[in-house]
Interface confidence: low
């Protein structure tokens, strides 16, 4: 229903703590360079204003839309043009164009230093002195680096962060307690960031219909006992919620997400038998738990899908009468039977089914034409299954680091024009799929692998879109979202690429590498590996193994030397010479 004051309505629904957190996230995602102190000042002003509207909904400006209120706040920032350049031009526009303009200026790769976790003692001190400010900094730092992070989920991670610090800061060995727990939160949050970016990409590029199809498939897998119309209702709600968050309507998004959780918990009987444990939790944890819920058991007596979608003589009539509903029902029926498939694969099958009906229902004998459609799914199913098998075997053989390197070589050969830092980031993330998915039971591997890879490749596409350099990447990124992963997998060595000149300085290292944490050391080595491939795109696996092994020994030797600097200075040029020779 309509409310006199939208901001008062959201404040009352969300409560002050969540309201402030969401406003901070919103401002941090729009103006990514502003310091925390500046944002928190704005948050307080907006909160005070919301309180006046709660007290009197007829007070001045309380009837304005949240976009208008937020936009006016952002546009009042002094020196906006100095810090943000053309983003300041947005302020000349009226709503809703002004908000659209802000969204277009979100930067997926802001020029910010990597978020450094403070040392355990220092972290606990500042947390204990002012927990609210500490967690506010966390929200700000994550939100500005991930401008599409799903806001209500970020509040959940802040809550987790709070729990970990509350527990560990009383321990004698704070670091031993904090490190693994915060690493786990960070890992989950980073995966959540790329998954949500994919959802926003889907919404931005292909619209609500495409996103809703994704949601129908996902919900049908999770809730195979729910009826189609129930799934449709859930998918419609999830689509609305994600549209709001991707569009910067974070208060409405969080409020609607809480409403959906409430609805699901009130209607467990018609959705899933697995919800009860989630429904006993407080709001943020409840929504998160429902989002991660395990699949319900598939009904035992499901008939063959062929009966309604192939053998029924009325297939073309049903399709013609309500195409979207008929295809939606097909997607629902197929997905609820296949929790072992990725959503991307299910959407490919639905697309294939749709194309078959489009073709066959225009012909003389439709049943004869579409009669073999289910058999024609086979190659579409086999392709990702083989991908999982070969990649998991490679991961088991090489381990995570070695697997990342194999992926890095593969992708540098496919798209050598892409910047080395982007290739290294993508390969490291793609390589993590092994640790994340290959250890799972067989039935869970395919959905885990393919849907994760799709999200990581979306990140590659988003970064490449900013500065397009590879025609092949542009081609894969421009097509349908569900075809991206197969498109990238099918890419081979780019024959049009002119190899990079061999620059000795690219392969020159100093003693500072010795003190780097393991992760940073790996990145240095992987940067060198990508550069080697760019120099010799057709280098064999053995050649690359030789050079990288040599390089690892060189680093190891010099880091153990008494005079490290001297070792790097003298041994470095020898390494470069040997590498050139090995790759000749």
């Amino acid at each position: 229903e309509a409310h006199k004051s939208e901001i008062a309505h959201r404040f009352k629904d969300l409560g002050e703590q969540h309201f402030k957190g969401l406003v901070l996230i919103a401002f941090s995602q729009y103006l990514q360079k502003c310091p925390y102190e500046e944002h928190i000042k704005l948050v307080q002003e907006v909160t005070d204003f919301a309180k006046t509207c709660v007290a009197d909904e007829n007070a001045e400006n309380c009837d304005k839309s949240i976009h208008t209120l937020f936009g006016d706040k952002l546009c009042a920032i002094p020196k906006l043009r100095d810090n943000y350049g053309e983003l300041a031009d947005c302020c000349a526009k009226q709503e809703p164009e002004r908000n659209e303009c802000f969204l277009q200026h979100k930067d997926d790769n802001p020029n910010l230093p990597p978020f450094q976790r403070p040392e355990a003692e220092a972290m606990c001190t500042s947390f204990q002195e002012n927990p609210t400010s500490f967690l506010g900094h966390y929200l700000h730092e994550v939100a500005r680096r991930h401008p599409y992070f799903y806001a209500p989920e970020l509040l959940y991670y802040a809550e987790k962060y709070n729990e970990v610090l509350t527990q560990c800061c009383t321990e004698s060995d704070k670091a031993a307690c904090l490190t693994p727990k915060l690493d786990a939160v960070k890992e989950k949050a980073l995966v959540a960031a790329v998954r949500q970016r994919m959802k926003c990409s889907s919404m931005q590029r292909f619209g609500e219909r495409a996103f809703k199809a994704w949601a129908v498939a996902r919900m049908s897998q999770r809730f195979p006992n729910a009826e189609f119309a129930e799934i449709t209702k859930l998918a419609t709600d999830v689509t609305k919620i994600n549209k709001e968050c991707c569009h910067g309507d974070l208060l409405e998004c969080a409020d609607d997400r809480a409403e959906l959780a409430k609805y699901m918990c009130e209607n467990q009987a018609t959705i899933s038998s697995k919800l009860q444990a989630c429904c006993d939790k407080p709001v943020l944890q409840k929504s998160q738990c429902l989002a991660e819920i395990e699949h319900d058991n598939i009904p035992a007596d499901l008939p063959s899908i062929a009966a309604d979608f192939v053998e029924d003589k009325e297939v073309c009539k049903n399709y013609a009468e309500a195409k979207d509903v008929f295809l939606g029902t097909f997607l629902y029926e197929y997905s609820r039977r296949h929790p072992d498939y990725s959503v991307s694969l299910l959407l490919r099958l639905a697309k294939k089914y749709e194309a078959t009906l489009e073709k066959c229902c225009a012909e003389g004998d439709p049943p004869a034409c579409y009669g073999t459609v289910l058999a024609e799914f086979q190659p579409l199913v086999e392709e990702p299954k083989n991908l999982v098998k070969t990649n998991c075997e490679l991961y088991e053989k090489l381990g995570e680091y070695g697997f990342q390197n194999a992926v890095l070589v593969r992708y540098t050969q496919k798209a050598p024009q892409v910047s080395t830092p982007t290739l290294v980031e993508a390969a490291r993330n793609l390589g993590r799929v092994g640790t994340k998915c290959c250890t799972l039971p067989e039935a869970q591997r395919l959905p885990c692998v393919e849907d994760y890879l799709s999200a990581i490749l979306n990140r590659l596409c988003v970064l490449h879109e900013k500065t397009p350099v590879s025609e092949k990447v542009t081609k894969c990124c421009s097509g349908s979202l569900v075809e991206r992963r197969p498109c990238f997998s099918a890419l081979t060595v780019d024959e049009t690429y002119v190899p990079k000149e061999f620059k000795a300085e690219t392969f020159t290292f100093h003693s500072d590498i010795c003190t780097l944490p393991d992760k940073e050391k790996q990145i240095k080595k992987q940067t060198a590996l990508a550069e080697l491939v760019k120099h010799k795109p057709k280098a064999t696996e053995d050649q690359l193994k030789t050079v990288m092994g040599d390089f690892a020994q060189f680093v190891d030797k010099c880091c153990k030397a008494a005079d490290k600097d001297n070792c790097f200075a003298t041994e470095g040029p020898n390494l470069v010479a040997r590498s050139k020779e090995a790759l000749a």
Epitope: F228, A229, N318, A322, V325, T329
Partner: nanobody, 126 residues
Framework: QVQLVESGGGLVQPGGSLRLSCAAS????????MGWFRQAPGKEREFVAA?????????YYADSVKGRFTISRDNAKTTVYLQMNSLRAEDTAVYYC??????????????????WGQGTLVTVSS
């Protein structure tokens, strides 16, 4: 949106049969579970039968009609049927067709359903 119109009611002798039809208009018929309810004079409306959204879907029945009544649907004709056999005097009522997102919710004591028909009278009497 779905509009529902029932037909097929009438006077029948005990032990006889009737087939009720409910024609739905609206392009999203196959998105809905369909059901039949009845209301006898001076009594509350009660659940009779429901079927999930797709042809050959799962069916649910009230204990009092199990084995005698059969619910079915034809999505091509956007129609739901209630075949009533071995009719008894206590089956006399106005029979209503209904549509909802879920066949299971229809079985609740007083379901608040989004779509109802106007009803068709069934009288079982000798």
């Amino acid at each position: 949106q779905v509009q529902l119109v029932e037909s097929g009611g009438g006077l029948v002798q005990p032990g006889g049969s009737l087939r009720l039809s409910c024609a739905a208009s609206g392009r999203t018929f196959i998105a809905y579970a369909m059901g039949w309810f009845r209301q006898a004079p001076g009594k509350e409306r009660e659940f009779v039968a429901a079927i999930t959204n797709f042809a050959g879907g799962t069916t649910y029945y009230a204990d009092s009609v199990k084995g005698r009544f059969t619910i079915s649907r034809d999505n091509a004709k956007t129609t739901v049927y209630l075949q009533m056999n071995s009719l008894r005097a206590e089956d006399t009522a106005v029979y209503y067709c209904a549509a909802d997102r879920s066949a299971q919710t229809m079985r609740q004591v007083r379901p608040v359903l989004p779509y109802w028909g106007q009803g068709t009278l069934v009288t079982v009497s000798s």
